[in-house]
């Protein structure tokens, strides 16, 4: 027989020879990191037809790391289903808890013993320090010193000393989240007031108000014979300015030589200004919808 078969889990005892006589026996032993569990044979014999009798390494089992229990308030998950060396053990914590330590341990071979690559981690409760205090405002549970996971606080603004109220800019409700951090930055309380939006040759059609505070929304329409240059809808933003800016109403010119400025309502820029009745958003001459302001 030629050289005996080689295996992943067991090795030949002694040096291999190039040829073996019929009837000659070779013995195997489990490799380092493996251990033998009977009854499977670990030897073979050179048969009369010059082949080796069947033998396998299935009696050699990988060394195993000790079993690790799930951490308190968490879970240990075997990546490949066994504790044999080479295994990975992944740790996750239940919602509301965070991991202290390594989230993966590896089953490694030290000499002939399989051991884990480190200590199992712990799952600690997620806690947050109190959220920031804000100027001109306050939050609920201001007396609480430690917040647990998903505990929420709601911010509100103080009454303003002047005629205009404070607006709350940002998220009014924030909660204690992962990494022991709050879900959002603390909001801001400040007076946000946009100027009265004046549009020459046009008028406001919605969003009427005494004053225009944060997030106030106004819509416009141009007089007959004028078209809107800009957006028909504007919003009062946190820096007390309108966004987009207050639009303009420009005169519709019937001259075929002049180009029309872009309008928020139009598609591609036309090469001339069409008559009013054909301009996007304008009525036909017999439709008097723009003649009355609040009809």
């Amino acid at each position: 027989c030629e050289a005996p078969p080689t295996f992943e889990a067991m090795e030949l005892i002694g040096k291999p020879k190039p040829y073996y006589r019929v009837g000659e026996r070779v013995d195997y032993k489990c490799k380092k990191g493996y251990f033998y569990i009977p009854p499977l044979a670990t030897h073979t014999i050179c048969d009369r037809n010059h082949t080796w009798l069947p033998v396998s390494d299935e009696g050699c089992y990988r060394e195993m790391c000790p079993h690790i229990r799930d951490p308190l308030n968490g879970e240990a998950i075997l990546a490949n289903g066994s504790y044999e060396f080479g295994a990975e053990l992944h740790f996750i914590c239940n919602e509301g808890y965070y991991l202290i330590g390594k989230d993966i341990l590896y089953c490694e071979l030290k000499d002939t013993v399989a051991i884990w690559s480190g200590k199992p981690p712990l799952c600690e409760k997620i806690l947050c320090t109190p959220p920031p205090k804000i100027k001109n405002g306050k939050h609920t549970f201001s007396e609480v010193e430690v917040f647990e996971y998903l505990d929420a606080v709601t911010y509100s603004c103080d009454p303003a000393p002047g005629p205009d109220p404070f607006s709350l800019i940002g998220e009014s409700m924030i909660y204690c989240g992962n990494n022991s951090t709050w879900s959002h930055a603390a909001p801001e309380c400040k007076v946000v007031k946009c100027r009265f939006p004046v549009v020459e040759n046009g008028k406001q059609i919605s969003g009427f108000g005494k004053k225009f505070y944060y997030k106030a929304t106004v819509m416009f329409e141009c007089d007959k014979g004028y078209y809107l240059n800009g957006s028909d809808k504007i919003v009062c933003e946190s820096n007390s300015t309108w966004d987009p800016p207050v639009p303009k109403c420009l005169k519709v010119s019937t001259s075929p030589t002049t180009k029309s400025p872009t309008s928020s309502a139009s598609g591609p820029r036309p090469t001339y200004k069409p008559p009013v009745s054909n301009y996007p958003g304008y009525p036909k001459p017999d439709e008097g919808i723009l003649n009355n302001l609040d009809d």
């Epitope: 009265f196 004046v198 020459e200 009355n292």
Partner: antibody, heavy 118, light 107 residues
Amino acid sequence: EVQLVESGGGLVQPGGSLRLSCAASGGSVSSYDISWIRQSPSRGLEWLGVIWTDGGTNYNSAFMSRFTISRDDSKNTAYLQMNSLKTEDTAVYYCERVYDGYPWFAYWGQGTLVTVSS
Amino acid sequence: AIQLTQSPSSLSASVGDRVTITCRALQGISNYLNWYQQKPGKAPKLLIYYTSSLHSGVPSRFSGSGSGTEFTLTISSLQPDDFATYYCQQYIKLPWTFGQGTKVEIK
């Protein structure tokens, strides 16, 4: 509190020009939106135009071709330039500080009389 | 321009009377209407803005109401200091315009 004082009124012939001044004391004219309003027995109160803090202007289209509003921040003064004056322009002219960016006329000057007559 | 018409043009009343002045707009102006008081030889003074909001320092006997095209200024109990001319003013659309005025005289 800002005080507005108009000056420059007087007698002027039809077709003539006049420049009215509105001086601000106790505050910067550039910090306020300034409107010009006139009043006559025959025509009542008429809003002429406004100059906003950013220097932009809006006019009553009835006067746009003849009247111009401007501002000189170094002199802390707003102006109303009136050209091609007519007898019907005879009135008391007021400058007025617009209330906090809103068209509410809360802070008026004492007014200056302009008489257009030959 | 949006035309404002005040009624009556003048009225006579006594101290303690309840006085109502009306301002009508030819087009709807939402609540964008102000009221002013003017005494002879003086500049007008803002009384009420945005239909019903009292300007600072204005006595509470003055009140405003209305919406759209019809507005009223009410003086609940006329005082000697209230004999003056009253004007309404719209600001929904340029040019901003005034009513012709209502003169309140002593009866």
